[in-house]
Interface confidence: medium
């Protein structure tokens, strides 16, 4: 035989039990909520901050790039690569043919204002792509110069100058006073590079990395 | 739908399922305790043993930890 | 941690929580049912009403839908 509890004590015990159980429920739900919030908010904040950074970067160039043309890169919906709308894309870069005639330094500054540089050509495939968009009767500045006039050619983006991946016309470069490079068409040998005086106005080609959003 | 989107949808479903089940479990636990007390009060004394046995069952459940 | 990784980790946590709680809930439900049957079998007939009433309590719980 068990000694009988007072109904009052039993009710009090039940009340305590209920309190404990519901407290556990609240704590469990709170923990679940915290987990869920962390999962939803943190990544979105992470993504948001990344997007904000990207947008602020884009805002710098907004006056020049009011719209973007984007292509889905992978399976993931978030992997979009974009180029400003009039620009063309090839591999991981965007290209813009500037038809205004300017000196080499002004051309480079013009590209840099748009978040780009004068074009750096790294492969034959890249050159083959670029020339599809060029006019045969024009010359275009490249991002290649020899500021010392000592044939120490250097690319504007600090890419090492590799003699094996150059496309000079035969006999070029041929003048120590000509310190900037253009790409132009010669009927005898198609498209190639030539050294010219930097202050002589030419058209130019700008290149920038694709914008990933 | 992309992979991350699916993951968030699954998160939401599991989250809601967790909340609902937590509430159901706690409610059942309390109703079980209430039923045990009611059963104890209604018994004559002849059946105190039975009542006590039921009480013990609920006590055991009450302290039981979820499996790791 | 990257975005998707975090989501998958949370999925796993919620999934485990759901499984553990489902098992606990089912176990409690089964124990409640067993206790009711035991209580019914041990009663003399004089207390059939009491037993039935308890059974009803469990029946109600069994069919109850989760709160919306």
């Amino acid at each position: 035989m068990v000694p009988e509890e007072e109904p009052q004590d039993r009710e009090k015990g039940l009340w305590w039990f209920q309190l404990k159980v519901w407290s556990m429920a609240v704590v469990s739900i709170l923990l679940l909520s915290v987990c869920f919030t962390v999962s939803s908010v943190v990544p979105h904040n992470f993504m948001y901050s990344k997007t904000v950074k990207r947008l602020s970067k884009l805002r710098e160039y907004q006056q020049y790039h009011p719209s973007l043309t984007c292509v889905m890169e992978g399976k993931d919906i978030e992997d979009w690569s974009c180029c400003p709308t009039p620009w063309t894309s090839f591999q991981s870069s965007c290209y813009f043919i500037s038809t205004g005639m300017q000196s080499w330094t002004k051309s480079q500054k013009n590209c840099s204002v748009m978040g780009a540089d004068l074009v750096v050509i790294n492969t034959r495939e890249e050159q083959d792509f670029i020339i599809q968009n060029l006019k045969r009767n024009s010359s275009y500045f490249l991002g290649l110069s020899d500021p010392g006039g000592r044939r120490h050619w250097q690319w504007v983006d600090q890419t090492p100058y590799n003699e094996n991946v150059t496309f000079w016309h035969s006999g070029e470069p041929n003048n120590l006073d000509e310190r900037c490079a253009i790409i132009n068409f010669r009927s005898s040998e198609e498209w190639g590079w030539n050294d010219i005086h930097c202050h002589v106005p030419q058209k130019s080609i700008c290149k920038m990395k694709k914008i990933y959003i | 739908l992309g992979e991350p989107q699916l993951c968030y949808i699954l998160d939401a479903i599991l989250f809601l399922y967790g909340i609902v089940l937590t509430l159901l479990y706690c409610r059942l636990k309390i109703q079980v305790r209430k039923a045990a007390i009611t059963s104890y009060e209604k018994s004559d004394g002849v059946y105190t043993g039975l009542s006590t046995r039921n009480q013990e069952t609920y006590e055991t459940l009450k302290h039981e930890k979820p499996p790791q | 941690l990257g975005e998707p990784q975090l989501c998958y980790i949370l999925d796993a946590i919620l999934f485990l929580y759901g499984i553990v709680l489902t098992l606990l809930y089912c176990r409690l439900k089964i124990q409640v049912r067993k206790a009711a049957i035991t209580s019914y079998e041990k009663s003399d007939g004089v207390y059939t009403g009491l037993s039935t009433r308890n059974q009803e309590t469990y029946e109600t719980l069994k069919h109850e839908k989760p709160p919306q």
Epitope: P147, G149, D177, E178, C180, H197, H199 | - | -
Partner: antibody
């Protein structure tokens, strides 16, 4: 070796025009480079005035407004400075110099000619 | 216009020691790897002479004890070890933007 030599009046009256000549030997001014005028004030301050390039294009310092111009005589391999409406503030030593096309540093200088603006 | 500020205005260095002259631009004068700043040496009664172009390139015929460094807005001319003949005024010049401008000069004396 390239040599540059400035010549012109050492004294000019205010409001008059100053004309200077730079004679280049050892290099044709039509073959390349920028051909510059620079002046140095009594306190040692240097001021770039402008250039005429090998192909005849020119570039002037905006601070000189419309008072300044550069011309050349390719047959004599000379280029010239003309500064109108001079004031005492234009008192300086005037240098002609050859500037490399890029990055626009001046690698050869003349000896300079001293010009005083005084009534 | 881009303003170039040189410091110190004058400097006295013992023979064989290091002389350091600073040139600060009011805005960047760099195009990536190309820093469009140049250094000149001027001795009394002589025209300026180009020492260093594009921040760090030694003009032919200039002794290796002269060196230049820097980027964007801050540039330095170093002379080490200083010799008697280095007593002169040193100027920096920018060609990044028209009009080309010069620093105010730093007069180096040898102790």
């Amino acid at each position: 070796d390239v040599q540059l030599q400035e010549s012109g009046p050492g004294l000019v009256k205010p409001s008059q025009s100053l004309s200077l000549t730079c004679s280049v030997t050892g290099y044709s001014i039509t073959s390349g480079y920028y051909w510059n005028w620079i002046r140095q004030f009594p306190g040692n301050k240097l001021e770039w005035m402008g250039y005429i390039s090998f192909d005849g294009t020119y570039n002037y310092n905006p601070s000189l407004k419309d008072r300044f111009s550069i011309t050349r005589d390719t047959s004599k391999n000379q280029f010239f400075l003309k500064l109108n409406s001079v004031t005492t503030e234009d008192t300086a030593t005037y240098y002609c110099a050859r500037g490399v096309d890029y990055p626009k540093a001046m690698d050869w200088w003349g000896q300079g000619t001293s010009v005083t603006v005084s009534s | 216009d881009i303003v170039l500020t040189q410091s110190p205005a004058s400097l006295a260095v013992s023979l064989g020691q290091r002389a350091t002259i600073s040139c600060r631009a009011s805005e960047s004068v760099s195009m990536h790897v190309t820093h469009l700043i140049h250094w000149y040496q001027q001795k009394p009664g002589q025209p300026p002479k180009l020492l260093i172009y594009v921040a760090s390139n030694l003009e032919s015929g200039v002794p290796a004890r002269f060196s230049g460094s820097g980027s964007e807005t801050d540039f330095t001319l170093n002379i080490h070890p200083v010799e008697e003949e280095d007593a002169a005024t040193y100027f920096c010049q920018q060609s990044f933007e028209d009009p080309w401008t010069f620093g105010g000069g730093t007069k180096l004396e040898i102790k």
